[in-house]
């Protein structure tokens, strides 16, 4: 439905508050280095302009596309070249190339200071003094650090952020009320950002077909009672929503997401019995709730898949009729029967089935050729099952911190060229799979673990893409989206790696480590562990464990000493010497 003025259309659909918030998110995700005040000014100018278009859709410039309007506004920033360098060249381009250019310059790891949480009283005062600015600042700080954050979901986070301050700043013990809520929002926010980053990578690097296949599998698991046609409609709509958000079209994305939630709730009966509670909530909560809703129960007495996809003599005829529809039906039927499989496993099975049909439907006797196709699935299913079993056993034996350390060593040996901060961040996140998924029963372990690992490995892929240093990482990241995890799992020690020169400074520690939080202290120790492996890639587990135990004892001893700094200096030298001897450095 064509509108005379797109900006007026979106302003009316979304309302002023959401319109302003989404424009701020869009601008902060594009110009990640710009000061808050500059963005607020730009947003206010866009909002005033939108209001003139609402009043008169025929007014000057109101017929321009949102990309044109927003791009023109971003290109008025005076310090564009000084701050962003070659991104300023985007402004010489016309739409749609200009927007594509801005998208290409989004930085997954912007050089921004870590967000330090002020004292609770300071935050509460700021919240009470100017609630609107306080919440805008939250949107700005998250959006610029997470340039692919799912914008309508960030509105939901902001709503919860506001609710936390509204409640806790009146509480008797403000800190006890607020801090756990902020920790939860931070952790959920990081997880949400990483999940959305994978969706955008899927669309941008592997195309719409790859995303749609993922969505068919996931929605079929979630809504196993829904007909294939219903799932297909939801997939089409969901693909549009995520294509828009990943493309920076945040107003359209939020609007379409609201429409999709409305449709789902109006058609619950033909989608899922689990949606009732979600559909009673306000819009932002409703959309979030639908996105997280548990899988519905599988219909009773589903027939064997073999009848339609192996035994039928019309398999090749049906495949020829509409390849993607037939493969989509296969994926739908397989996924709705297997909530116990990861989405990536289901996609591997569908790919195997497709490859088999491509080969066998060309044969003189196709059925003879594809009769045993389901037998080919067995090893594909067993591989992640065995891997998860082994790693959950290791996690239960070691606990999270030591399990992370085992993964740090494993991944540093696989891809030692990757930067130490990236290896630490990714391995720590990989290690969290244990506490996240190993507690689940067998039937929920694989979808939890392998789909989570896909999200974490995508973080490695996007960080590595910015500064590529390892052909092995590039290969695993680009060859196949669904085989990334098996690709990384299959990597052995990189025998071509030349060990890093020993640098004593890397292993010099100071008294400031004693005042760090437990998490920060772990990161310091894990950073040292990665560096150790980079120096001595052939070190055994036992050697590394001995050095790390000595290191932990050294930190504990010096943090208890009266003269901490002297202790770190003197004992540190001894530790470095002992470690060098132990590892033969």
């Amino acid at each position: 439905d064509a509108h005379k003025s797109e900006v007026a259309h979106r302003f009316k659909d979304l309302g002023e508050e959401n319109f302003k918030a989404l424009v701020l998110i869009a601008f902060a995700q594009y110009l990640q280095q710009c000061p808050f005040e500059d963005h607020v000014k730009l947003v206010n100018e866009v909002t005033e302009f939108a209001k003139t278009c609402v009043a008169d859709e025929s007014a000057e410039n109101c017929d321009k596309s949102l990309h044109t309007l927003f791009g023109d506004k971003l290109c008025t920033v005076a310090t564009l070249r000084e701050t962003y360098g070659e991104m300023a060249d985007c402004c010489a381009k016309q739409e749609p190339e200009r927007n594509e250019c801005f998208l290409q310059h989004k930085d997954d790891n912007p050089n921004l200071p870590r967000l330090v949480r002020p004292e609770v009283d300071v935050m509460c005062t700021a919240f009470h003094d100017n609630e609107e600015t306080f919440l805008k600042k939250y949107l700005y700080e998250i959006a610029r650090r997470h340039p692919y954050f799912y914008a309508p979901e960030l509105l939901f986070f902001a709503k919860r952020y506001k609710a936390a301050f509204t409640e806790c700043c009146q509480a008797a013990d403000k800190a006890a009320c607020l801090l756990p809520k902020l920790d939860e929002l931070r952790d959920e926010g990081k997880a949400s950002s990483a999940k959305q980053r994978l969706k955008c990578a899927s669309l941008q690097k592997f195309g719409e077909r790859a995303f749609k296949a993922w969505a068919v599998a996931r929605l079929s698991q979630r809504f196993p009672k829904a007909e294939f046609a219903e799932v297909s409609k939801l997939v089409t709509d969901l693909t549009k929503v995520h294509t828009e958000c990943c493309h920076g079209d945040l107003l359209e994305c939020a609007d379409d997401r609201a429409d999709l939630a409305k449709y789902i709730c109006e058609n619950q009966d033909s989608i899922s019995s689990k949606l009732k509670e979600c559909c009673e909530k306000p819009l932002l909560e409703k959309s979030h709730c639908i996105a997280e809703v548990e899988n519905d129960e599988m219909p009773a007495d589903l027939p064997s898949l073999a009848a339609d996809f192996v035994e039928s003599k019309d398999v090749c005829k049906n495949y020829a009729e509409a390849k993607d529809v037939f493969l989509g039906m296969f994926l739908y039927e397989y996924a709705r029967r297997h909530p116990d499989y990861s989405v990536v496993l289901l996609l591997r099975l569908a790919k195997t089935y497709e490859t088999t049909l491509e080969k066998c439907c060309a044969a003189a006797d196709p059925h003879e050729c594809y009769a045993k196709v389901f037998d080919e699935f067995k090893p594909l299913v067993e591989e992640p099952q065995n891997l998860i079993k082994q790693n959950c056993e290791l996690f239960e034996q070691l606990g999270e911190y030591k399990f992370q350390n085992a993964l740090l060593v494993r991944y540093t040996k696989k891809v030692p060229q990757v930067s130490t901060p990236t290896l630490v961040e990714v391995s720590r996140n990989l290690g969290k799979v244990g506490s996240k998924c190993c507690k689940h029963p067998e039937a929920k372990r694989m979808p939890c673990a392998e789909d989570y690992l896909s999200v974490v490995l995508n973080q490695l892929c996007v960080l590595h893409e910015k500064t590529p240093v390892s052909d092995r990482v590039t290969k695993c990241c680009t060859e196949s989206l669904v085989n990334r995890r098996p690709c990384f799992s299959a990597l052995e020690v990189d025998e071509t790696y030349v060990p890093k020169e020993f640098n004593a400074e890397t292993f010099t520690f100071h008294a400031d480590i004693c005042t760090l939080s437990e998490k920060e202290r772990q990161i310091k120790k894990q950073t040292a562990l990665v560096e150790l492996v980079k120096h001595k890639p052939k070190a055994t587990k036992e050697q590394l464990k001995a050095v790390m135990d000595d290191f932990a004892a050294f930190v504990e001893k010096c943090c208890k000493a009266d003269d901490k700094e002297t202790c770190f200096a003197e004992e540190g030298k001894k530790l470095v010497a002992a470690s060098q001897a132990a590892l033969g450095l």
């Epitope: 003599k313 019309d314 398999v315 090749c316 005829k317 020829a320 009729e321 003189a364």
Partner: nanobody
């Protein structure tokens, strides 16, 4: 939309010959094995002959071996069945199908009678 159009059928005397052709559209013909199947009056479907996508593998039912020859032209998206030494028991409606599937077309009538 997959479409298969058979032609070339007719009335022929025993011992005579016919050439059936099938023109395909709506799918990547060169990627699929094809077959001829037939249905005699009051009987079920019978598979006659099959050919792989590249034409290298040809197979025949015992009842037609040595008399019928299947071939294809991927450039023209055409499947052919050359039928020699025809017998009355070859009387049937002949269909071309993808793989060894069920017919989805009108077929072409072959009648062998003196």
């Amino acid at each position: 939309q997959v479409q298969l159009q058979e032609s070339g059928g007719g009335l022929v005397q025993p011992g005579g010959s016919l050439r059936l052709t099938c023109t395909a559209s709506g799918f990547t013909f060169r990627s699929f094995g094809m077959s001829w199947v037939r249905q005699a009056p009051g009987k079920g479907l019978e598979w006659v002959s099959a050919i792989s996508a590249d034409g290298s593998d040809k197979r025949y039912a015992d009842s037609v071996k040595g008399r019928f020859t299947i071939s294809r032209d991927n450039g023209k998206k055409m499947l052919t069945l050359d039928m020699n030494s025809l017998k009355p028991e070859d009387t049937a409606v002949y269909y071309c199908v993808i793989g060894r599937g069920s017919p989805a077309s009108q077929g072409t009538q072959v009648t062998v009678s003196s």
